[in-house]
């Protein structure tokens, strides 16, 4: 039975040209995290595998940095980066958990972080 929950940074905003950290955290389970995939819509950004380390998609290599932890740092943001991001946790023995983050990239300096929220 899957008892865990994914906590994410929720809805966040950032300035064009700046950077942002995407973070998810798996709680309420003793399952072992074997891999975390980061995806934007249907496009793979990066994978963090417990044994193999990080794989950053070649098309994002210049502006995606691994970490901190299992999170992902997006740099040199453009308005095209606005959208949904997903952290997909592969765990043993539970299976797969998915968290969602919505990022809005703003032209002005009114970017503020949204509140944290949980996805069961």
């Amino acid at each position: 039975m899957m008892t865990g929950t994914i906590e994410t940074t929720g809805n966040i905003s950032a300035e064009k040209g700046g950077s942002i950290i995407l973070q998810c955290h798996l709680s309420s389970t003793t399952a072992q995290v074997t891999q975390v995939n980061w995806e934007q819509q249907d496009q793979l950004l990066a994978i963090c595998n417990a044994d193999l380390g990080w794989h950053i998609s070649p098309s994002f290599k210049d502006r995606v940095a691994p970490g901190p932890g299992l999170g992902l740092t997006l740099q040199s943001l453009t308005v095209n980066d606005t959208g949904e991001y997903f952290c997909i946790y592969h765990t043993y023995p539970d299976g797969t958990y998915t968290g969602r983050i919505f990022l809005e990239v703003l032209e002005s300096s009114v970017a503020e972080h949204g509140a944290r929220f949980q996805i069961p």
Epitope: T34, Q35, L44, I47, N49, A50, D51, L52, G53, H55, I56, S57, P58, S59, K61, H90, Y92, T96
Partner: antibody
Framework: QVQLVQSGAEVKKPGASVKVSCKAS????????MYWVRQAPGQGLEWIAF????????TYNQRFRGKATLTVDTSISTAYMELSRLRSDDTAVYYC????????????WGQGTLVTVSS | DIQMTQSPSSLSASVGDRVTITCRPS??????LSWYQQKPGKAPKLLIY???TLPEGVPSRFSGSGSGTDFTLTISSLQPEDFATYYC?????????FGQGTKVEIK
């Protein structure tokens, strides 16, 4: 088009070392990890290690730690694998291969380099 | 280590036949599996990655399916150039491992 050209066949004595090169062209060298795989005569495929030219970080199959050392020269888009303390059972074709866009698979392969270890 | 068991180890088939090769990892690898084709004296060539995705240039007669611990490579209508050895590989942990290969021969 993407191409990986490996150095020529080598014959070495037991205990010696050998350095195999893999020259990449047709893509941005630093964006893709380079993998090394070997195939003993008449046998299957065995992964050795890979290196990320972007940061120089390497990940090894534990079985080849201390045997294989990977390096890159990004200025000439070339990856290298040095094999040390060669034994007769290291006789194999050694392949370099460019990693995939979406994970740890091997998208494009070099033609292979036969390393023969014989006294 | 994740062990990759391919079956059969060899098979004989005729041009036009439908051919199926199975790969069974020793543990759940989700869909992190690729397939390669190797002809004698040549380097392997990627046929499928992530269990079912064909790279550009691979003929559509090749298809992959499966997830977890049961995967299949299918050649819908065998062509003369398809006689070769096929390998599966997981890309989910260290070490990356390959199946022992399936040799497809002419009947």
């Amino acid at each position: 088009q993407v191409q990986l050209v490996q150095s020529g066949a080598e014959v070495k004595k037991p205990g010696a070392s050998v350095k195999v090169s893999c020259k990449a062209s047709g893509y941005a060298f630093s964006r893709y990890s380079m993998y090394w795989v070997r195939q003993a005569p008449g046998q299957g495929l065995e992964w050795i290690a890979f290196i990320d030219p972007y940061n120089g970080g390497s990940t090894y199959n534990q079985r080849f730690r201390g045997k294989a050392t990977l390096t890159v020269d990004t200025s000439i888009s070339t990856a290298y694998m040095e094999l040390s303390r060669l034994r007769s059972d290291d006789t194999a074709v050694y392949y370099c291969a460019r990693g995939g866009d979406y994970g740890w698979y091997l998208g494009v392969w070099g033609q292979g380099t036969l390393v023969t270890v014989s006294s | 280590d994740i062990q990759m068991t391919q079956s059969p180890s060899s098979l004989s088939a005729s041009v036009g036949d439908r051919v199926t090769i199975t790969c069974r990892p020793s543990e759940n690898i989700y869909t992190y599996l690729s397939w390669y084709q190797q002809k004698p004296g040549k380097a392997p060539k990627l046929l499928i990655y992530n269990a079912k995705t064909l790279p550009e240039g691979v003929p559509s007669r090749f298809s992959g399916s499966g997830s977890g611990t049961d995967f299949t490579l299918t050649i819908s209508s065998l062509q003369p150039e398809d006689f070769a050895t096929y390998y599966c590989q997981h890309h989910y942990g260290n070490p990356l491992t390959f199946g022992q290969g399936t040799k497809v021969e002419i009947k």
